[in-house]
């Protein structure tokens, strides 16, 4: 079970210092961006961090939403990485959900975070490179210490 | 109603593994609905929460102890137990073992409502 | 984790007065805290939880209020038993932390 507690806006950046954002054909994508060029790309930049309590004491609980005509949220269904057309909803009943993932410090770096799937275990969000796009997917955390699967997270409230 | 009497060595050599048992009566920790947890506290300090188990066995731990701590549960016994290895100096705390409602919507959740009375527990060749 | 910061670290007063005890989480927790009440070489006992609701059997001079980050433990009339070390502790999200405790003593 999951209840909804409160939500942030969040501008999320890989270790490159590499912007998330939702491109056109909602799709999450990273790129250089400056300080300037993320403020004129809201609200592509600005991710709706939902909190969670969770009936299990896993950690922090998030969903990750997006408000452009309307709001999407990330799933990781079937291990794909897309966004999907819904509001977080107030309460998940369910231990696991595609659009629930535990947000965690990683040890000795407080400002750096890491985002596991709650439906898959030790899948991790994380930064790919494919071809000339920096994508957003879903991965098994394979070596201790793996950047791709670190993100910083900055509250814009 | 439900009460948690606390057992095992006091004195631990470094480098050995602390072990502490917790027995329930007036209560069954197969029922459902509760964790069954461990904290701990320095003399002169805060409070630490240890790790908790769950009747269906699942266990969850404080990641800052995660690499040393097993929690398991003997429902025969109605009993769950603490063990954590490598100890050290720093280890030396009272250990409380405490009954946790769970949350599945509730508000009287995720509290330590129902203590044992504490073991201190010294690390020390 | 969650850190939560408790003030006073110390508070004297005397019978009768009226005490609060103030807690600060280093991020929003919404409503999900407790406050533990622990006499020396006694386990804590659980006074308040979900900020504001009374464990049963718990005085009606208890009382707390906040959400979000900023919550308060008030105590409207001091009796002789209530000196004593309180925690606050989230309860919100794992892993389950405490403040360090305000001690309570007799001025």
């Known amino acids: 079970y999951f209840g909804k507690l409160e939500s942030k806006l969040s501008v999320i950046r890989n270790l490159n210092d590499q912007v998330l954002f939702i491109d056109q054909g909602n799709r999450p994508l990273f790129e250089d961006m400056t300080d300037s060029d993320c403020r004129d790309n809201a609200p592509r930049t600005i991710f709706i961090i939902s909190m969670y309590k969770d009936s299990q004491p896993r950690g922090m609980a998030v969903t990750i939403s997006v408000k452009c005509e309307k709001i999407s949220t990330l799933s990781c269904e079937n291990k794909i990485i897309s966004f999907k057309e819904m509001n977080p909803p107030d309460n998940i009943k369910d231990t696991k959900s595609d659009i629930i993932f535990f947000q965690r410090s990683v040890p000795g770096h407080d400002n750096k975070m890491q985002f596991e799937s709650s439906s898959y275990e030790g899948y991790f969000l994380a930064c790919e490179k494919e071809r000339d796009l920096f994508k957003l997917i879903l991965k098994k955390e394979d070596e201790l210490g793996d950047r791709s699967i670190m993100f910083t997270v900055q509250n814009e409230d | 109603q439900v009460q948690l009497q606390q057992s095992g060595p006091r004195l631990v050599k470094p480098s050995q593994t602390l072990s502490l048992t917790c027995t329930v009566s007036?209560?069954?920790?197969?029922?459902?609905?509760?964790?069954w947890s461990w904290i701990r506290q320095p003399a002169g300090k805060g409070l630490e929460w240890i790790g908790s188990?769950?009747?269906?066995?699942?266990?969850y731990y404080n990641p800052s102890l995660k690499s040393r701590v097993t929690i398991s549960g003997d429902t025969p016994k109605n009993q769950f137990s603490l063990k954590l290895s490598s100890v050290t100096a720093a280890d030396t705390a009272v250990y409380y073992c405490?009954?946790?409602?769970?949350?599945?919507?509730?508000?009287?959740?995720?509290?330590?409502?129902?203590w044992g009375r504490g073991t201190l527990v010294t690390v020390s060749s | 984790d969650i850190v939560m910061t408790q003030s006073p670290s110390t508070l004297s007063a005397s019978v009768g007065d009226r005490v609060t005890i103030t807690c600060r989480a280093s991020?929003?927790?919404?409503?999900?805290l407790a406050w533990y009440q622990q006499k020396p070489g006694r386990a804590p006992k659980v006074l308040i939880y979900?900020?504001?609701t009374l464990e049963s059997g718990v005085p009606s001079r208890f009382s707390g209020s906040g959400s979000g980050t900023d919550f308060t433990l008030t105590i409207s009339s001091l009796q002789p038993e209530d000196f004593a070390t309180y925690y606050c502790?989230?309860?919100?999200?794992?892993?389950?932390?405490f403040g360090q405790g305000t001690k309570l003593e007799i001025k």
């Open positions: 405490a009954r946790t409602p769970a949350y599945f919507g509730q508000d009287r959740t995720d509290f330590f409502d129902v």
């Open positions: 007036g209560g069954s920790i197969s029922s459902g609905g509760y964790y």
């Open positions: 188990i769950y009747y269906s066995g699942s266990t």
């Open positions: 991020q929003g927790i919404s409503s999900w």
């Open positions: 979900k900020a504001s």
């Open positions: 502790a989230n309860i919100a999200f794992p892993p389950w932390t």
